[in-house]
């Protein structure tokens, strides 16, 4: 992410190296880890970002109750296999030939198996629930102000179409952001809710993926919104397939 010619940098992804060697001699930015060219006018796919991260030197309530099929990313970081478009391949394997199936946000949705494990398709995560707890404040935030600020954030910072922010719930100190995006709704050029959620997660953790921008400074009517805990639930278009042993554990 350093080449100087014509400000050859990637504003939306600092985990890149840019060089004026693209088509027509234009600036081209390659994701670390994979070397795949990325479109710096939009968010980079989560798969390429995870791969880059792994290659980097070693770094009557209104609240929604997640459904029984909701997945939480308990497995943490891994070095994923991405397809030619930068999406997660349906089957992921580690160096010891342990394999598992993932959804479109790269979260495991089956028990782990061996190389014979089949993952017929990449199952789409169509509903993401971002569950936040904010630090204590003098008083509760105004719900409509909070709603407007978070919608603005997803629209302006992450370029996510407003129709994909389904709802913002608030019960002090818990905030929930619901993102919904079915396969049929996602048009060419639309930011994926999984990518937007990942950028948001990294922002909240103070690990912004944006080049040269300051960290996330969330304010509601001038009052800082500081998050102290984040949980993200992923709901797939097809429920995950785990053995009963895991479900009862």
């Amino acid at each position: 992410h350093t080449a100087a010619q014509d400000n050859c940098t990637c504003p939306t992804n600092k985990m890149t190296v840019c060089s004026p060697d693209g088509p027509g001699g234009r600036c081209q930015c390659r994701a670390l880890g994979s070397g795949m060219a990325v479109d710096c006018s939009t968010l980079t796919s989560k798969c390429l970002l995870l791969k880059a991260r792994m290659s980097a030197p070693k770094n009557a309530r209104t609240l929604v109750r997640p459904s029984e099929h909701a997945l939480v990313d308990n497995d943490g970081l891994y070095d994923p296999d991405c397809d030619p478009e930068g999406r997660f391949k349906a089957r992921q394997c580690n160096q010891t030939s342990v394999c598992w199936c993932v959804n479109s946000v790269g979260v495991r949705r089956t028990d782990k198996g061996d190389l014979s494990l089949r993952c017929d398709e990449l199952v789409r995560t169509h509903h993401i629930l971002i569950d936040l707890r904010h630090r204590p404040t003098a008083g509760a935030f105004n719900h409509s102000d909070l709603d407007a600020e978070l919608r603005r954030l997803f629209r302006e910072r992450y370029r996510l179409h407003p129709k994909f922010v389904a709802a913002v719930h608030y019960e002090q100190p818990t905030i929930q952001i619901e993102l919904r995006q079915n396969t049929s709704q996602k048009a060419a050029g639309d930011v994926d809710i999984g990518d937007a959620a990942y950028y948001f997660e990294r922002d909240i953790k103070g690990e912004s993926l944006f080049q040269g921008r300051g960290g996330l400074d969330l304010r509601v009517r001038g009052e800082p919104l500081q998050v102290e805990r984040t949980l993200i639930y992923y709901l797939d278009e097809i429920p995950p397939k785990f053995s009963m042993k895991r479900l009862t554990a």
Epitope: A3, A4, S19, P20, D21, P23, S34
Partner: antibody, heavy 115, light 107 residues
């Protein structure tokens, strides 16, 4: 004009190491990748890896991890490749090229590993 | 890794003929393919970049086409100086890979 000048031929013993150089001129060294390619006599071209001098990022073909080490000195616009634990299989011509499109190539360094 | 398969291994043509070299990728790589010529005892030379972009100083008889997985390098009127090995290379993702090459011979 852009030029990549490689160091001269090397004759070395098995088990030793060698470090070859690639001096760039005619462009901003820190703006482009330098890639290294191996060619054994009668064989095709094999990508070893690359280095981005602007940030010292490196990538290696899995086959050459532990064999090749890529470095760069921005003050002299020179890229280096060290090959270790040499065997006869390492005897080849080694090229440096400006990447990611290899639009300029060095003249090659011939490495002969022989006892 | 992306596998590039070049065919045929050897092409034998008469001067003035049109010749085409094929390069097939094991997965879609857009237009991230480049073509090189290597004469005997010489370094490779870039002929075409990004599947079809011409290179300054390369004769106009060289052209390229294709996208996705199938790519072609063409010489519309072969000259004796074109005797060489021809390689395709992908820069879609690391590790970069080369095709096995096609040797052009003149009848």
């Amino acid at each position: 004009q852009v030029q990549l000048q490689q160091s001269g031929a090397e004759l070395v013993r098995p088990g030793t190491s060698v470090k070859m150089s690639c001096k760039a001129a005619g462009y901003t060294f820190t703006n482009y990748w330098i890639d290294w390619v191996k060619q054994r006599p009668g064989h095709g071209l094999e990508w070893i890896g690359n280095i981005f001098p602007g940030g010292f990022y490196t990538n290696y073909n899995e086959k050459f991890k532990g064999k090749a080490t890529l470095t760069a000195d921005t003050s002299s616009s020179t890229a280096y490749m060290q090959l270790s634990s040499l065997t006869s299989e390492d005897s080849a011509i080694y090229y440096c090229a400006r990447g990611g499109v290899f639009d300029y190539w060095g003249q090659g360094t011939t490495l002969t590993v022989s006892s | 890794d992306i596998l590039l398969t070049q065919s045929p291994a050897i092409l034998s043509v008469s001067p003035g003929e049109r010749v085409s070299f094929s390069c097939r990728a094991s997965q879609s790589i857009g237009t991230s393919i480049h073509w090189y010529q290597q004469r005997t005892n010489g370094s490779p030379r870039l002929l075409i970049k990004y599947a079809s972009e011409s290179i300054s100083g390369i004769p106009s008889r060289f052209s390229g086409s294709g996208s996705g997985t199938d790519f072609t390098l063409s010489i519309n009127s072969v000259e004796s100086e074109d005797i060489a090995d021809y390689y395709c290379q992908q820069s879609n993702s690391w590790p970069y890979t080369f095709g096995g090459g096609t040797k052009l011979e003149i009848k």
